[in-house]
């Protein structure tokens, strides 16, 4: 599986590095942090135990989404 790989970037244009996820059952994930008055911060990668989630974060939310196709 091929996933985009980045950490704490403010633009999807900075999240175009590709990572080859070699473990069976891995998924791609995207974490988006949206906080009032702040930029959205994006992280992406591979995970064996990805679960869609929404967590309280500062005065906003951190949303995690999972997918299982190349560069999804």
């Amino acid at each position: 599986l091929l996933c985009y790989s980045c950490k704490a970037q403010v633009s999807n244009e900075d999240c175009l590095q590709v990572e080859n996820c070699t473990q069976l059952g891995e998924q791609c994930w995207t974490a988006r942090i949206r906080a009032v008055g702040l930029l959205t911060v994006i992280s992406k990668g591979c995970s064996l135990n990805c679960v869609d989630d929404s967590q309280d974060y500062y005065v906003g939310k951190k949303n995690i989404t999972c997918c299982d196709t190349d560069l999804c």
Epitope: K7, I33, G45, Y57
Partner: antibody, heavy 120, light 95 residues
Framework: QVHLQQWGAGLLKPSETLSLTCAVY????????WSWIRQPPGKGLEWIGE???????SYKPSLKSRVTVSVDTSKNQFSLKLSYVTAADTAVYYC??????????????WGQGTLVTVSS | SPGERATLSCRAS???????LAWYQQKPGQAPRLLIY???SRATGIPERFSGSGSGTDFTLTISGLEPEDFAVFYC?????????FGQGTKVEIK
């Protein structure tokens, strides 16, 4: 057991480039980000930046213009370069493993530290 | 003094979810060691006398019975945003 071993020049003149390397022994190299953190003498900890095996980097914004973190996956090593150093860059520099999930930052294994002194 | 309870505080400048706070211990001449993550989860190999609590802006590290090897500087760290930042450190000294 994970072990991080670091090395590099300890004495620099102003305007030179700091260069440090960290080798990772044991555990998975590809499953983590690998960080550089510094500590000026008698002061607190400051995160500099990090990289993963595929070359994705993240830097502290105030240092980004001077910092390059690179990776050599064939040797399980990663490196720090900090250009145009001044006396304010004098610190103990640590490499560390970042085991944070989903974009978090959590440092669970650390190198032994390298004291870098900048003096004319 | 050894055997006593130590309570260390960390206050965030704005509310962070409880997931995003860690504590480290640093002894002189050594690298920091991760103690607590997620505000209250002990890292691997950390004795049960170390415990963490809190959420929002106020967090606490408690050492229930100080051992001689526990005297050190303790740092809190917010884990969730870039750049990650550390508190200024709290020194626990032998009385």
């Amino acid at each position: 057991q994970v072990h991080l071993q670091q090395w590099g020049a300890g004495l620099l003149k102003p305007s030179e480039t700091l260069s440090l390397t960290c080798a990772v022994y044991g555990g998975s190299f590809s499953g983590y980000y690998w960080s550089w953190i510094r500590q000026p003498p008698g002061k607190g900890l400051e995160w500099i930046g990090e990289i993963n095996h595929s070359g994705s980097t993240s830097y502290k914004p105030s240092l980004k213009s001077r910092v390059t973190v690179s990776v050599d996956t064939s040797k399980n090593q990663f490196s720090l370069k900090l250009s145009y150093v001044t006396a304010a860059d004098t610190a103990v520099y640590y490499c560390a493993r970042d085991r944070g999930d989903y974009g978090d930052f959590l440092f669970d294994y650390w190198g032994q530290g390298t004291l870098v002194t900048v003096s004319s | 003094s050894p055997g006593e309870r130590a309570t260390l505080s960390c206050r965030a400048s704005q509310s962070i979810g409880s997931t995003y706070l860690a504590w480290y211990q640093q002894k002189p001449g050594q690298a920091p060691r991760l103690l607590i993550y997620g505000a209250s989860s002990r890292a691997t190999g950390i004795p049960e006398r170390f415990s963490g609590s809190g959420s929002g802006t106020d967090f606490t590290l408690t050492i229930s019975g100080l051992e001689p090897e526990d005297f050190a500087v303790f740092y809190c760290q917010q884990c969730g945003s870039s750049p990650p930042t550390f508190g200024q450190g709290t020194k626990v000294e032998i009385k």
